[in-house]
């Protein structure tokens, strides 16, 4: 399940006398090119990431789906380590994402696209826990409902990550990852799953339809999306409190 090695080399950043910590640090030292870069978050070995440079600074692409070329129905260890092709579809890896965010709050951007070409860009404030929390995503109220929380405490809800072989979802009666597909912060199963099975047309059987890529509050429950991209950017340390 290792991330494939890219063809082109990572860019050099001369102003830093070490590898950059993340895409945002790259942006802050003047890098304006998007693409593949080697980074080294604190306490982590170096690894390659896809950076997208925008008016909101440098963002790390943590997930991309657009053609069904990569199987996302994988076990815990794969989601932890990352898999896919950095030039195509991929999941960066929970451990890598956590090493980038550390204990800081982060901004999560989610780009969704349906089969009619309509697009939606969502932004959330989140906090990602480490493996000891099953990489729980702590959510502010607006997104918590979309990931399965019916009532959200003021501090936000923590939704653990789940795969078919490590069931941490908020349902006692079922394993969301088994009944749906892929690994995700499932909550109560029915609100979203951007790591589901890729469908080019809407399956007739509801059981199959449930396994797709969907975001309930945008195109509806189980509408199979055409493309998704997830990007993350840690907030400055003082903004995390």
């Amino acid at each position: 399940p290792e991330m494939a090695q890219p063809v082109d080399p990572a860019h050099n950043v001369s102003r830093l006398h070490r590898l950059p910590r993340d895409c945002q640090e790259l942006f802050q030292v003047g890098e304006r090119q998007s693409g593949l870069f080697e980074i080294q978050p604190q306490g982590s070995p170096p690894f390659l990431v896809n950076c997208k440079m925008t008016s909101d600074g440098g963002w790390t692409v943590i997930q991309r789906r657009h053609d069904g070329s990569v199987d996302f129905n994988r076990p815990w260890e794969a989601y932890k380590a990352g898999f896919g092709d950095p030039h195509g579809e991929f999941w960066l890896g929970l451990e890598k994402v956590h090493s980038i965010t550390g204990d800081r709050n982060s901004r999560l951007a989610v780009q969704l696209r349906d089969w009619d070409g309509n697009a939606e860009l969502l932004q959330f404030s989140v906090h990602l826990g480490g493996e000891d929390t099953a990489y729980s995503l702590q959510l502010t109220a607006p997104v918590a409902g979309q990931l399965g929380a019916t009532t959200v405490p003021p501090s936000g809800l923590s939704v653990p990550f789940s795969t078919w072989d490590q069931d941490h979802d908020l349902r006692r009666d079922k394993n969301c990852a088994k009944s749906l597909s892929g690994g995700w912060w499932f909550g109560t199963c029915s609100h979203s799953n951007l790591n589901g099975q890729y469908f080019r047309s809407i399956p007739q059987q509801r059981q199959k339809l449930k396994k797709g890529i969907f975001w309930k509050t945008w195109r509806g429950r189980y509408y199979p999306l055409q493309a998704t991209t997830m990007l993350i950017q840690p907030m400055a340390a003082e903004a995390a409190s």
């Epitope: 304006r32 909101d56 991209t229 990007l231």
Partner: antibody, heavy 118, light 107 residues
Framework: EVQLVESGGGLVQPGRSLKLSCAAS????????MAWVRQTPTKGLEWVAS????????YYRDSVKGRFTISRDNAKNTQYLQMDSLRSEDTATYYC???????????WGQGVMVTVSS | DIQMTQSPSFLSASVGDRVTINCKAS??????LNWYQQKLGEAPKRLIY???NLQTGIPSRFSGSGSGTDYTLTISSLQPEDFATYFC?????????FGGGTKLELK
């Protein structure tokens, strides 16, 4: 439906000021970076300035730095371009544009004409 | 800054023709390339985003291809409403740069 409507253009003398506005509707304004792009028959399309979603970060092309100020009011779904010390070479049609994360400039306003002449 | 060289600057063609317009970047832009159409007195309209993705509501006769530094917009069968100016935008490098434009005229 995404709509961007510019206003505030006109004829102005060199050295004077003008403020452009862009009213946005049909999308969550605070989720998108915004930009101003200008167009002339000789130079074609030129990016002028960009602003981050929250408005705290701004970027300018070198030729307008120190003279132009981009800003936004997310409560009013509006972005602005304050143009000071205008020069004849600033004469152009100015477009307000929406900038997404992974697909960049997707929607443009109809444009507003700015003419700097004595 | 990344330079975008668009060719040709002018193109004469007839209804039904297949036409191609090219944009060459001064360095790799990782498929972050959009194509736009602009008619006289109108705002630019995005046709293609990220090299080959068709914008909502754009006819399928428009297509895009390319990678690295070389990108192409193809109109498979020209229609009367397609006579306009076309330009590309690279957004691999923030804030992005435009091609010089291609004016497509009726032969």
């Amino acid at each position: 439906e995404v709509q961007l409507v510019e206003s505030g253009g006109g004829l102005v003398q060199p050295g004077r000021s003008l403020k452009l506005s862009c009213a946005a509707s049909g999308f969550t304004f605070s989720n998108y970076g915004m930009a101003w792009v200008r167009q002339t028959p000789t130079k074609g399309l030129e990016w002028v300035a960009s602003i981050s979603t929250g408005g705290s970060d701004t970027y300018y092309r070198d030729s307008v730095k120190g003279r132009f100020t981009i800003s936004r009011d997310n409560a009013k779904n509006t972005q602005y371009l304050q143009m000071d010390s205008l020069r004849s070479e600033d004469t152009a049609t100015y477009y307000c544009a929406r900038q997404g994360f992974t697909e960049d400039t997707d929607y443009w306003g109809q444009g507003v004409m700015v003419t700097v002449s004595s | 800054d990344i330079q975008m060289t668009q060719s040709p600057s002018f193109l004469s063609a007839s209804v039904g023709d297949r036409v191609t317009i090219n944009c060459k970047a001064s360095q790799n832009i990782n498929k972050y390339l959009n194509w736009y159409q602009q008619k006289l007195g109108e705002a630019p309209k995005r046709l293609i985003y990220n090299t080959n993705n068709l914008q909502t509501g754009i006819p399928s006769r428009f297509s895009g291809s390319g990678s690295g530094t070389d990108y192409t917009l193809t109109i498979s069968s020209l229609q009367p409403e397609d006579f306009a100016t076309y330009f590309c935008l690279q957004h691999n490098s923030f804030p992005g740069t435009f091609g010089g434009g291609t004016k497509l005229e009726l032969k």
